[in-house]
């Protein structure tokens, strides 16, 4: 660092003064020198180090007509917004000839009301749930003591006697405000006021009460909501497609869920118009006047299989002698599950009904008993799933086969005796 020499008399006729103030202060330091001949550039030092980017001005006023006469030089250093890093000892420095001259020092100090480095933030918390708030302040002057306030009421008898940087709150049952006061020798600064909003706790024990192919009934246990009664709960249901891939506790579903509101109590809801034999994920959250609780984890549920809602379509039955050829198509109505096969029933006017399980085939050749002279023979077909049989088709009369009619080759199925079924 440059050092001044006392070999010659110092050219400084005015030295920097002192500034002490609060953060953000705008201040100016000045030094004045009188020199003979060409005025030098004035540099500023802080704690002995040249300030390369000093916000300084320089005025030079000649005291005579000749350039070799004396000049008054004034340099001013601006501190635009005082910070802790600006504090220190300030001097002016000039190079005259082969010598350095430094002024007497001036001092800049930061001293004021406490300054907050961290203030409590607004947040939401579940009722009766512990949480922490933070507050941090500094001087100078130190020490800085903190006093926490809840709803404008101090939480300690005096600053510094209660919790300091971190305030642990064991739980709240009503929305409250928190602030902290920072005290030092200069006075008191109050932080921003944080509003802590008390929301209902997350509902618990979301479970299935009953299942129908297109309906699920679910129930849950509400969490505590402080002094604020629950106004309603909201249930969301999502189809559990593989592509969706809902993770347990994932905050937001990737596509728009079905959302239903349930008035409370009871903490139960019937979800209708669902797809049978379909996996879903459901979750629930409850609302008070203060807002919505956090959602439960997504619960995987599944609607059970149902029976097919309609009979097979386009049934045709033709007879050729002692053989009957029957074929049909899958029901157009929803199957409500996995199709396991078809049941076929045929009956003559005065003969008992014969029931057969055809499996998944959609055609069959029947070997009729006797010479095929049974009159008014009719056929019915029903589809079935694991949940049972769907509705039977209307009886289809067996038509005599006419030459030229298409007649596929069918595997012969011997009629086997079966218990009689009445028509649906």
């Amino acid at each position: 660092a440059p050092r001044g020499t006392q070999a010659e008399e110092s050219p400084f006729v005015g030295n920097p003064g002192n500034i002490t103030g609060a953060r953000g202060l705008t201040g100016t330091l000045r030094c004045q020198l009188q020199v003979q001949g060409e005025p030098p550039e004035v540099h500023w030092l802080r704690d002995g180090q040249i300030l390369e980017l000093a916000d300084s001005t320089q005025t030079q006023v000649p005291l005579g007509e000749d350039e070799q006469d004396d000049w008054i030089v004034v340099s001013q250093l601006r501190i635009a917004s005082l910070q802790l890093s600006d504090a220190g000892q300030y001097q002016c420095l000039v190079f005259l000839g082969h010598q350095n001259f430094v002024s007497q020092p001036g001092y800049v100090g930061l001293e004021g009301l406490p300054y907050f480095l961290e203030e409590p933030e607004d947040r939401t918390v579940a009722a009766n749930t512990p949480f922490n708030l933070s507050c941090q302040a500094q001087g100078p002057p130190e020490p800085v003591d903190l006093l926490w306030l809840q709803d404008a009421v101090p939480l300690a008898t005096a600053p510094g006697h209660g919790p300091q940087r971190n305030l642990h709150v064991p739980g709240l049952n009503k929305t409250s405000s928190f602030s902290c006061e920072a005290h030092n020798a200069k006075g008191v600064t109050t932080s921003r006021t944080a509003t802590i909003t008390v929301l209902p706790q997350q509902p618990r024990n979301l479970h299935l009460v009953s299942r129908q192919p297109t309906e699920l009934e679910v129930a849950w246990t509400p969490g505590l909501s402080g002094i604020y009664p629950l106004t309603h709960c909201t249930l969301q249901a999502m189809l559990s497609d593989n592509e969706v891939g809902i993770q347990a506790g994932e905050p937001d579903p990737p596509e728009e869920p079905l959302t239903l509101q349930a008035s409370v109590p009871p903490h139960q809801l019937r979800l209708g118009s669902l797809h049978p034999h379909t996996p879903y994920h459901i979750r629930v959250a409850c609302t008070s006047s203060q807002g919505l609780s956090s959602w439960t984890h997504w619960l995987p549920v599944e609607t059970p299989e149902g029976v097919p809602l309609g009979p097979p379509e386009n049934i045709s039955a033709t007879r050729n002698g002692s053989q009957a050829f029957v074929h049909w198509q899958e029901p157009r109505a929803p199957l409500q599950g996995t199709l396991l096969g078809y049941r076929l029933a045929y009956q003559g006017q005065d003969t008992p009904e014969v029931l057969m399980d055809i499996g998944l085939r959609q055609e069959v050749t029947l070997e009729l008993q006797g010479d095929g002279s049974v009159s008014n023979l009719t056929v019915c077909v029903a589809a079935y799933t694991a949940a049972g049989d769907g509705p039977w088709s209307l009886p289809v009369p067996l038509e005599a086969w006419r030459p030229g009619q298409a007649q596929p080759v069918h595997q012969l199925v011997k009629e086997t005796s079966a218990p009689a079924f009445s028509w649906p």
Epitope: T28, C31, A54, D55, S56, T59, Q76
Partner: antibody, heavy 121, light 107 residues
């Protein structure tokens, strides 16, 4: 005699630009900070910014930051206010003013002792 | 930013009256307050700097006082040329801010 004379004001469309000049005489621009202050019609005074002509450092009010630029040419003893992206609310008389320099070793704050006559934007 | 609140916003007075204008800062500004006089169509003129120092050439009937947050400009005996608008200004922090002005009118 110390004097500041502004020029360059006029009518401009919103979104337009204008450059104001502040010519100083009777003192050296290098020795002081030069401020720009504006006054909307029938309203009070609002600080726009300052420049240290000796170093070229400038500070701005938040309302003009990024749109206005203050500069100075010490050889011409003139300061400038370049105004871009002008808005209706920038309509005002613009003054340049010299910061008063006391002769003590230090001071907190400042005042403006010489003002130009103002130019209407 | 520091707010400067001037009162009254206007006043009527007669020549020879003692007039007091006050200015309150929203936080401590030490003595970094200046007072200006402005007449219609003219630039402001510096009257007082550093709260209480009379600027060169300003008549001694003008005086300033105060420190911290409360400041006063006093005109001990109002003269015809004193009818104008007066502004206080803090420069303790950047940006400097002005009061909204006090208009002194002839009663």
């Amino acid at each position: 005699e110390v004097q500041l004379v502004e020029s360059g004001g006029g009518l401009v469309q919103p979104g337009g630009s204008l450059r104001l000049s502040c010519a100083a005489s009777g003192f050296s621009l290098s020795g002081s900070w030069i401020h720009w202050v504006r006054q909307a019609p029938g309203k009070g005074l609002e600080w726009v910014g300052w420049i240290n002509p000796y170093r070229g450092y400038a500070y701005y009010a938040d309302s003009v930051k990024g749109r206005f630029t203050i500069s100075a040419d010490t050889s011409k003893n003139t300061a400038y206010l370049q105004m871009n992206s002008l808005r209706a609310e920038d309509t005002a008389v613009y003054y340049c003013a010299r910061e008063y320099s006391g002769w003590g070793g230090s001071s907190v704050g400042y005042a403006m002792d010489y003002w130009g006559q103002g130019t209407l934007v | 930013d520091i707010q400067m609140t001037q009162s009254p916003s206007s006043l009527s007075a007669s020549v020879g009256d003692r007039v007091t204008i006050t200015c309150r800062a929203s936080q401590d500004v030490s003595t970094a307050v200046a007072w200006y006089q402005q007449k219609p169509g003219k630039a402001p003129k510096l009257l007082i700097y550093s709260a209480s120092f009379l600027y060169s050439g300003v008549p001694s009937r003008f005086s300033g006082s105060g420190s911290g947050t409360d400041f006063t400009l006093t005109i001990s005996s109002l003269q015809p040329e004193d009818f104008a608008t007066y502004y206080c200004q803090q420069s303790y922090t950047t940006p400097p801010t002005f009061g909204q002005g006090t208009k002194v009118e002839i009663k």
